[in-house]
C-alpha cells in the first residue's frame, strides 16, 4: 500500500476553497479501505471505502470528502476560514483482506486574511 | 534504469536448502510502493509466483510452497534474496526475480533468471 | 487460489491474419472500490523473461505497439493482435493480481503459420 498526498504547500484565500489530494495505490484489489485526514495531529475524520463508496461525505469543519476511482482520495474545504491554516495528513489502510497501512506527507495549509493589509507581513514570511 | 541481477548454485542435491540472491541495482529496494518477487518457471513453461517483499520487509509467500519458502533482504547491500528448503526434482526450474509497484501492478522489471536443477 | 485458464494451448496464424488468445478466471477480477481489472498480459520470446503487453485487462504498456488489444472484464478477457507480425511469436501468459497467490495462465504459444 502506498499513499502519495499533495501539494506539499497550499496558500489561498480566506473564503476561497482548498482542495487536497491523497492517491492511495495498492497492488492487489481490497475489499473495505480505510482512509482519515488529520490536522496538527487531531483526526478531522476516519470513513471507509467499500463498493465503490465512502462511508461519510464530510471531514471537519466545511470539508468535503470524495472518492474517484481508482486511486484518488479528496479533501475539499470551501470555504475556508483562517483557523484552517495547519498541517494536513491523509492516512489509509487496507482493513479487508489483510491489514497494511500506509499515510502521505504534509501539506501545509495557509490561508491569508481576506484583508490583504492583515497579511503584508505574512506574505513575506512565507516567500513563493 | 532499474535492473536485477539473480545469483547462486545452478545444482541442488535433494532435501538440500536452495539458497538465491538478486542484487538490485539503480534503484533503491526500500522505496516506498515497490515488491521485490521471486518467481520460477518450471521446464514445461509454466510461470509460478513464490513470493515477495515489500518496501517495508513485510512478506507474503504462496501456500502452494508452504513454510519450504522464505525471501529475505539486505537494504545495505540492496540484495533480496531466496531461501526454499527440502527441495526435490520438482523444483527443478528456472529461478527469475522481478519487479512491481502498487501503482503500476504488473512485473516491470525481470532478471534473466538462473537455472537450478534438483538432482544428487 | 485463483485459476487461469488460458485457451488456445498453441496458435499459428499467418502473417498479417488477426490472432485471438483468450483467459478465463475462476473467479472475477474486477474491483468496483477501483473500478479495475486486476489482470496483465506477457509476452516471452525464447531465451528471454516475460515483458509486459497490457496492464488492467486494457491499458497497453508505453511503447507497445497498438496492434496488441486487450479486452473484457469478470472473468472473460481476451488478447487480440490485429495484424500479426514475425516479432509477435512466441509464449504469451495473463497473469492476475486480485489478491495473493498472483497466478499465471500455463500461456499459448503462437507461432507463424
Known amino acids: 500500500l502506498s499513499v502519495q498526498q499533495g501539494p506539499n504547500l497550499l496558500q489561498v484565500r480566506q473564503g476561497s476553497q482548498a482542495t487536497l489530494v491523497c492517491q492511495v495505490d495498492q497492488a492487489t484489489a481490497w475489499e473495505r479501505l480505510r482512509v482519515k485526514w488529520t490536522k496538527d495531529g487531531a483526526i478531522l475524520c476516519q470513513p471507509y471505502i467499500t463498493n465503490g463508496s465512502l462511508s461519510l461525505g464530510v471531514c471537519g469543519p466545511q470539508g468535503r470528502l470524495s472518492w474517484q476511482a481508482p486511486s484518488h482520495l479528496t479533501l475539499q474545504l470551501d470555504p475556508v476560514s483562517l483557523n484552517h491554516s495547519g498541517a494536513y495528513v491523509c492516512w489509509a489502510a487496507v482493513e479487508i483482506p489483510e491489514l497494511e497501512e500506509a499515510e502521505g506527507n504534509i501539506t501545509r495549509l495557509f490561508v491569508d486574511p481576506d484583508d490583504p493589509t492583515q497579511n503584508r507581513n505574512r506574505i513575506a514570511s512565507f516567500p513563493g | 534504469q532499474v535492473q536485477l541481477q539473480e545469483s547462486g548454485p545452478g545444482l541442488v542435491k535433494p532435501a538440500q536448502t536452495l539458497s538465491l540472491t538478486c542484487t538490485v541495482s539503480g534503484f533503491s529496494i526500500s522505496t516506498s510502493g515497490y515488491y521485490w518477487s521471486w518467481i520460477r518457471q518450471f521446464p514445461g513453461k509454466r510461470l509460478e509466483w513464490m513470493g515477495y517483499?515489500?518496501?517495508?520487509?513485510?512478506?507474503s509467500y504462496n501456500p502452494s510452497l508452504k513454510s519450504r519458502v522464505t525471501i529475505s533482504r539486505d537494504t545495505s547491500k540492496n540484495q533480496f534474496s531466496l531461501k526454499l528448503t527440502s527441495v526435490t526434482a520438482a523444483d527443478t526450474a528456472t529461478y527469475c526475480c522481478?519487479?512491481?509497484?502498487?501503482?503500476?501492478?504488473?512485473?516491470?522489471?525481470w532478471g534473466q533468471g538462473t537455472m537450478v536443477t534438483v538432482s544428487s | 487460489d485463483i485459476v487461469m485458464t488460458q485457451s488456445p494451448d498453441s496458435l499459428a496464424v499467418s502473417l498479417g491474419e488477426r490472432a485471438t488468445i483468450n483467459c478465463l478466471s475462476s473467479?472475477?477480477?474486477?474491483?468496483?472500490?477501483?473500478?479495475?481489472?486486476?489482470l496483465n498480459w506477457y509476452l516471452q520470446k525464447p531465451g528471454q523473461s516475460p515483458k509486459l503487453l497490457i496492464y488492467h485487462a486494457s491499458t497497453r504498456l508505453s511503447g507497445v505497439p497498438d496492434r496488441f488489444i486487450g479486452s473484457g472484464s469478470g472473468t472473460d478477457f481476451t488478447l487480440t493482435i490485429s495484424s500479426l507480425q514475425a516479432e509477435d511469436v512466441g509464449d504469451y501468459y495473463c497473469?492476475?493480481?486480485?489478491?495473493?497467490?498472483?497466478?499465471f495462465g500455463d500461456g499459448t504459444k503462437l507461432e507463424i503459420k
Open positions: 473467479q472475477s477480477l474486477f474491483s468496483s472500490n477501483t473500478n479495475r481489472n486486476y
Open positions: 522481478a519487479t512491481m509497484a502498487d501503482r503500476f501492478a504488473f512485473f516491470d522489471v
Open positions: 517483499i515489500n518496501y517495508g520487509g513485510g512478506t
Open positions: 497473469q492476475h493480481h486480485y489478491e495473493t497467490p498472483l497466478t
